[in-house]
């Protein structure tokens, strides 16, 4: 990661005045607490069209999104932070086709954290982007109570204690 030389620059001929520097001091809006909702700000920076999406090394591409499958195990909140620090989020599953893609690439039978947890504030299962789960598409096996987070196993979604340690999937 060492950097080679960056040479000093000059402007030959003519008088050059220093350009004014622009500085944006606006704060990144973040919710209080562990849970931080994904913002739409800079969304255009992510991708302009599905066809042009190119994922980083180690990330798999599917339907215009990039997916990363962990090898280690963490709690739901640690997994959540892990994804966030990589400008991504825990997996949000939109349909059964996406679930099939995920299952095909998991290659193991254990639980895997996804971006869904039970929020005591709303008293409902909510995806990390703030949207509610579509009960017509997905059914969650297990208790819907405080400190419950969702994990997938063999194309099914299970309610598990958030402090449990499982593998996880990041998505952007």
């Amino acid at each position: 990661l060492l950097v080679s030389q960056g040479v000093l620059l000059k402007c030959q001929k003519g008088s050059c005045s220093n350009a004014t520097q622009y500085e944006d001091t606006g704060d990144l809006k973040v919710n209080n607490g562990t849970r931080r909702n994904i913002s739409n700000k800079d969304l255009c920076a992510s991708r302009s069209a599905d066809q042009t999406v190119l994922c980083q090394s180690e990330w798999l591409k599917y339907q215009g999104k990039c997916y990363w499958f962990s090898n280690e195990m963490k709690s739901w909140s640690d997994s959540y932070v892990y994804c966030l620090e990589r400008k991504s989020h825990l997996l949000i599953i939109h349909d059964q086709l996406e679930m099939a893609f995920i299952q095909k690439n998991l290659r193991q039978l254990n639980y895997v954290w996804i971006g869904l947890n039970f929020t005591s504030l709303k008293m409902t299962w909510t995806w990390v982007d703030g949207s509610p789960i579509d009960s017509k598409i997905f059914f969650i096996k297990g208790p819907a109570k405080e400190n419950s987070c969702a994990a997938i196993k063999e194309s099914k979604i299970f309610s598990e204690t958030c402090s449990s340690v499982f593998k996880w999937i990041c998505q952007y």
Epitope: E23, L28, S39, A45, S88
Partner: antibody, heavy 116, light 110 residues
Amino acid sequence: SLEESGGDLVQPEGSLTLTCTASGFSFSSSYCICWVRQAPGKGLEWIGCIYSDSGNTYYASWAKGRFTISKASSTTVTLQMTTLTAADTATYFCARDSGTTSWRYNIWGPGTLVTV
Amino acid sequence: ALVMTQTPSSVSAAVGGTVTIKCQASQSIGNDLAWYQQKPGQPPKLLIYAASNLESGVPSRFRGSGSGTKFTLTISDLECADAATYYCQGTYRGSSISWPFGGGTEVVVK
């Protein structure tokens, strides 16, 4: 804005701690703060970063062990440097990421000079 | 480890002309690339983020393109004030995140 301080003349094998101070915002929110250095007449070199809420740190491979980034308070992040050599002589900058779905280091301090 | 290679190390062009700077990543980084302008005695100034997004306040004469491993910064209608060193910075989103810089390109405006 950001401002670095603590730059000084230090003896070889010595240690030094630099401080990055924020004004107009605090590190209590989720920010990625990075340290970058620039030797005289040379290019920019990434040292490492810290996420202000989790405290998780990431370093360039050459910086691991000798450089430590930590959050000292809600407005300060520090860079501790040990076993300094002449090769560490540089201007040290701190920068803040403002992006959400992409990295956007648009807030930089003016830099502080370290001479070994 | 992610390595960013920037070319050329120096380029010269006349006022009103166009300059193209290239940056290559050692592995695919999607669109996770930024471009900076730096003048002597000043910190770097962000020009482009996410490969092609123009930072607020930066003239549209600066254009970023590319994805994967190959990226380009194009400066058109060159002005004297564009004389500076330009750096690319990639981001690797792997298990250990890294943000290496390219070696820098000197732009001399004649």
